[in-house]
C-alpha cells in the first residue's frame, strides 16, 4: 500500500522538515526560515510561533517542530501551550481585574498565581488550630481539644498542614 501510495502521490515521500513544492514539479523542498513541518507529505510548512514581547522562547523552532514559549519574569503561563501570560502577584495576593489585591481575612495564597483560598477549618476534622493562618499561609491544625485536657498521657504530634491544591497552569 505504501509503495502504491508513493507511486500515486510523490508528496508522500517528503519527510518532516520539508514540503512538497508544487512550483518545482512536486519535489521535496526544505521548509523556509521561520517555518516547520512536523509530519511528512506536507504541501506547505507552518509558520513558527514567535515568542516576543511578554513571551520568551523556551524551545527554538526547528525545521520539524514549532517553537515553545514561556513568559518573561514577573508573568506566568496560562492556557494550553502558554497561549497567554498573566501577571504574577505576591504571595498573600490574588489577581483581579484591577490588579493584585491582598487576600481577604480568612483566606490565603502561598503562590504567585491563582486565587486566595479559605483557611482549613480544623474543627471539621475534630482538631484545633495549632498555628494561626495568614494571607500567605494556611492554618496548621493540631490535636483535638480533648487530647490537650489535663491528665492526658501523651500529646499527639500535630497533623501535617493540608497540601493546598495547585491552580492550573
Amino acid at each position: 500500500f505504501e509503495r502504491t501510495r508513493s507511486l500515486q502521490d510523490p508528496c508522500s515521500n517528503c519527510p518532516a522538515g520539508t514540503f512538497c513544492d508544487n512550483n518545482r514539479n512536486q519535489i521535496c523542498s526544505p521548509c523556509p526560515p521561520n517555518s516547520f513541518s512536523s509530519a511528512g507529505g506536507q504541501r506547505t510548512c507552518d509558520i513558527c510561533r514567535q515568542c516576543k514581547g511578554v513571551f520568551r522562547t523556551r524551545k527554538e523552532c526547528s525545521s520539524t517542530s514549532n517553537a515553545e514559549c514561556d513568559c518573561t519574569p514577573g508573568f506566568h503561563c496560562l492556557g494550553a501551550g502558554c497561549s497567554m501570560c498573566e501577571q504574577d502577584c505576591k504571595q498573600g495576593q490574588e489577581l483581579t481585574k484591577k490588579g493584585c489585591k491582598d487576600c481577604c481575612f480568612g483566606t490565603f495564597n502561598d503562590q504567585k498565581r491563582g486565587i486566595c483560598r479559605p483557611w482549613t477549618n480544623c474543627s471539621l476534622d475534630g482538631k484545633s488550630v495549632l498555628v494561626n493562618g495568614t494571607k500567605e499561609r494556611d492554618v496548621v491544625c493540631g490535636p483535638s481539644p480533648a487530647d490537650l485536657s489535663p491528665g492526658a498521657s501523651s500529646v499527639t504530634p500535630p497533623a501535617p498542614a493540608r497540601e493546598p491544591g495547585h491552580s492550573p497552569q
Partner: antibody, heavy 118, light 110 residues
C-alpha cells in the same frame, strides 16, 4: 464580528496631552497585542507602541519619553496618552490588533485625525 | 528615517508585475517574520501578507511575499488599477522589543 473604534478629541493644544481610547467590540481584549500606529500628513505609518491585556507595554524609542498606554479589560478598552505635543504630532492615529503568535496587524480601526494647534 | 527601508515609489502598466523590496538588518527582518499592508489614504490599512509569504483569505493570489536574509519583497503580478495604493512592510525588531515599519512604497498604475 470584532471591531476597533478610536475616540478622543480631534484638536489638542501644543504642550498639552493627547489622549485617545480604542474600544474593542464583538470580542475579548484578553490575549493579543493592542497597538497604536500613526500617520502624519504626507508621511509614512509609524508604530507608537503596544500593550498586552495584562498591562505589559513597550513603546517606540522616539516617543518613549512622552508616551504611555493603559488597558481596561472590564471595559474592553485600551488608551494612548502622549504628552507635551507639538505640531509634529498632528496625524491620523490608528489602533490595531496584533497577533501575538505571528506578529501581524490583522484588525485596524478606521483612524482618527488629531490636529495639534493653538 | 525608518530602520527598514523601502523604495518610495514603483509603477507599472495594467497586467505587469511589480516588485517592492524591504531591506532591514539582523535584528529585524533577519531574525523575524515579515508582513505587508496595503493602504489607500482615508481608509484603514489592510493585511496582505503575513509570515513572510502567507496570504489571508480574501487576498488575491496576485500578491505574493518572500524573504531572504535581511530583505523581503512583495510582488504584485497582473497589476490592476485598484492596486494603486501605498504598501508597507512590517516586522518585529529584537533590539526594540517592538515593531518597525518600512517607509512605504507608492504604487502607481500607469
Amino acid at each position: 464580528q470584532l471591531q476597533l473604534q478610536e475616540s478622543g478629541p480631534g484638536l489638542v493644544r501644543p504642550s498639552e496631552t493627547l489622549s485617545l481610547t480604542c474600544t474593542v467590540s464583538g470580542g475579548s481584549i484578553s490575549s493579543f497585542y493592542w497597538t497604536w500606529i500613526r500617520q502624519p500628513p504626507g508621511k509614512a505609518l509609524e508604530w507608537i507602541g503596544y500593550i498586552y491585556h495584562n498591562g505589559y507595554s513597550r513603546y517606540s524609542p522616539s516617543l518613549k519619553s512622552r508616551v504611555s498606554m493603559s488597558v481596561d479589560t472590564s471595559r474592553n478598552q485600551f488608551s494612548l496618552h502622549l504628552n507635551s505635543v507639538t505640531a509634529a504630532d498632528t496625524a491620523v492615529y490608528y489602533c490595531a490588533r496584533a497577533n501575538n503568535d505571528y506578529l501581524f496587524f490583522d484588525l485596524w480601526g478606521r483612524g482618527t485625525l488629531v490636529t495639534v494647534s493653538s | 528615517q525608518s530602520v527598514v527601508t523601502q523604495p518610495p515609489s514603483a509603477s507599472g502598466t495594467p497586467g505587469q508585475r511589480v516588485t517592492i523590496s524591504c531591506s532591514g538588518s539582523r535584528s529585524n527582518i533577519g531574525s523575524n517574520i515579515v508582513s505587508w499592508y496595503q493602504h489607500v489614504p482615508g481608509t484603514a490599512p489592510k493585511l496582505l501578507i503575513y509570515g513572510n509569504a502567507q496570504r489571508p483569505s480574501g487576498v488575491p493570489d496576485r500578491f505574493s511575499g518572500s524573504k531572504s536574509g535581511t530583505s523581503a519583497s512583495l510582488a504584485i503580478s497582473g497589476l490592476q488599477s485598484e492596486d494603486e495604493a501605498d504598501y508597507y512592510c512590517a516586522t518585529w525588531d529584537d533590539s526594540l522589543s517592538g515593531w518597525v515599519l518600512g517607509g512605504g512604497t507608492k504604487v502607481t498604475v500607469l
